[in-house]
Interface confidence: low
């Protein structure tokens, strides 16, 4: 006869491991007992359990409550056992020794491999701002046994660097993703992908990129200066910019307070029927958490009684 077993048994941390040992004998042969021991290199054999044809299963004190026979129906020639709730410390070499009648003893070894699935974590880097050089966008760390694979899935252009720290029974892998921030990256997903044999599917953690920026400000509404004459209704100035976070707008007048009747509505400055009092220098102040921009315009309200044409000055400042 001969023993049938597996070279390697792989189990995920916390699951039950079936350690197979089946005697395929000739007709009439019987199994008297199956002794299981742990036989790691450099250490003496440590008894695990004894499965006897007459008195059943005996488990060594070190494994009490953790070793069982597989559920029925059972074949008398099957010396397999279940190791409950596998832990990392269970990883190693095991031997089953089968005593048969009349053929004698047989032995076989197997390796138990306990997979420790990683619990990855993603840590965003410092706040991303347009104009920075190569900057850490995020780092992703996963520890497991064996060492997990950590990669990045993104359409954003960047560079990755990885480092690994080996511990006694596991390895921690950290991968960093660096990029040069630009506004086009806003809202783009940056996904850390962790692969490991103990995972049914890759684990993915997604970080949404936020790149702070603020575009130059400009003011619209003064394209046709001739429209800015005494009595005109509905005159307005509109401040143009864009940013992340979306900017807020504030209007002031450089040469005094805003005239009465002038309405501030976010990015728009609305005027009542124009009078010469509305002539002046108006400043749109655009800001977000990243930066601020100013754009100022000079409004000259024309008096139809006067002939002289007036020039319009547009000045932008950051």
């Amino acid at each position: 006869g001969e023993l049938e077993t597996s070279d390697v048994v792989t189990v995920v941390l916390g699951q039950d491991a079936k350690l197979p040992c089946f005697y395929r004998g000739d007709s009439g042969e019987q199994v008297g007992q199956v002794a299981w021991a742990r036989v790691d290199a450099g250490e003496g054999a440590q008894e695990l359990a004894l499965l006897h044809s007459k008195y059943g299963l005996h488990v060594s004190p070190a494994y009490e409550g953790r070793v069982e026979q597989p559920p029925p129906p059972r074949n008398p020639l099957d010396g397999s056992v279940l190791l409950r709730n596998a832990v990392q410390a269970d990883e190693g070499e095991y031997e089953c020794r089968v005593s048969t009648f009349p053929a004698g003893s047989f032995q076989a070894r197997l390796r138990l491999r306990v997979l420790v699935p990683p619990l990855p974590s993603l840590n965003p880097g410092p706040a991303l701002e347009e104009g920075q050089g190569l900057t850490l966008a995020a780092s992703c760390t996963a520890e497991g046994s064996p060492a997990p694979s950590v990669t990045w899935d993104t359409e954003v252009k960047g560079t990755t660097s990885s480092r690994s720290f080996k511990h006694s029974r596991s390895a921690a892998v950290t991968s960093e993703f660096h990029l040069v921030p630009s506004r086009s990256m806003n809202g783009q997903p940056l996904t850390c992908v962790v692969s490991h044999p103990g995972l049914l599917q890759d684990q993915r953690i997604t970080h949404i990129l936020h790149v702070s920026f603020l575009a130059e400000a400009s003011v619209r509404g003064l394209e046709d200066q001739n429209l800015w004459h005494i009595g005109r209704e509905g005159a307005m100035l509109k401040c143009l910019s864009e940013g992340q976070p979306p900017p807020s707008y504030n209007w002031t007048r450089l040469d005094g307070p805003l005239p009465s009747g002038v309405r501030v509505d976010g990015d728009t400055l609305g005027f009542p029927p124009l009078t010469t009092e509305h002539s002046g220098i108006y400043v749109c102040h655009v800001s977000n958490e990243f930066s601020s921009r100013d754009s100022q315009v000079t409004v000259d309200v024309l008096d139809p009684q006067e002939d002289s044409g007036k020039q319009v000055d547009l000045v932008s400042a950051s």
Epitope: R183, S184, G187, I208, R220, Q244, P245, P246, D265, G266
Partner: antibody, heavy 118, light 108 residues
Framework: QVQLVQSGAEVKKPGASVKVSCKAS????????MHWVRQAPGQGLEWMGI????????TYAQKFQGRVTMTRDTSTSTVYMELSSLRSEDTAVYYC???????????WGQGTLVTVSS | SYVLTQPPSVSVAPGQTARITCGGN??????VHWYQQKPGQAPVLVVY???DRPSGIPERFSGSNSGNTATLTISRVEAGDEADYYC???????????FGGGTKLTVL
């Protein structure tokens, strides 16, 4: 995942107003502009305007100036588009779309059919 | 205001390459975005910033933009590509979004 869920179909009489809602989820509501685009039956896409969910400022297409109002409620992550003085030619599917700076639309609502008929 | 001109229709046999153009004055100076719209559905972004593809969009979809013409190219056309395609830009001078009139792609 990002979702934009719009209110249901509306039937309105000429001269009335309609208010369509668009509830955002799956992302930071105040971090992205929201646009409204409409499409008349058998016609192309027509941009109506944009709202900044953070500050509430808006820019409207010249064609709709004076008739459209876009608002938002940050507490419910919802934007609204109200169109007044409805005419039969306003019959269309109205879409909200999340704007990416650039500007393009990476996520769209499912659309709301507004029918204007006497 | 800025105008984008698309051919009303383009026909192509399966497996061939379809090219849909979008004309506009000096459009090469603008970022062009392309959307696919199938009947009864909302538009879907297929190309942005002239030639970039969102995740999930097949590599068969590509874009280019120079001079007065932007082009959406669909290689190895499949029956499922039959749809309306729209180009779009942001016109800074008018502070407005502009769509092309749309092109119906028919797979023969």
């Amino acid at each position: 995942q990002v979702q934009l869920v719009q209110s249901g179909a509306e039937v309105k009489k000429p001269g009335a107003s309609v208010k369509v809602s668009c509830k955002a989820s799956g992302y930071t509501f105040t971090g992205y502009y929201m646009h409204w685009v409409r499409q008349a039956p058998g016609q192309g896409l027509e941009w109506m305007g944009i709202i900044n969910p953070s500050g509430g400022s808006t820019t409207y297409a010249q064609k709709f100036q004076g008739r459209v109002t876009m608002t938002r409620d940050t507490s419910t992550s919802t934007v609204y588009m109200e169109l007044s003085s409805l005419r039969s030619e306003d019959t269309a599917v109205y879409y909200c779309a999340r704007g990416r700076l650039g500007t393009y639309f990476d996520y769209w609502g499912q659309g709301t059919l507004v029918t204007v008929s006497s | 205001s800025y105008v984008l001109t698309q051919p009303p229709s383009v026909s192509v046999a399966p497996g061939q390459t379809a090219r849909i153009t979008c004309g506009g004055n000096n459009i090469g100076s603008k970022s062009v975005h392309w959307y696919q719209q199938k009947p009864g559905q909302a538009p879907v972004l297929v190309v942005y910033d002239d030639s970039d593809r969102p995740s999930g969009i097949p590599e068969r979809f590509s874009g280019s933009n120079s001079g007065n013409t932007a082009t959406l190219t669909i290689s190895r056309v499949e029956a499922g590509d039959e749809a309306d395609y729209y180009c779009q830009v942001w016109d800074r001078s008018s502070d407005q979004v502009v769509f092309g009139g749309g092109t119906k792609l028919t797979v023969l």
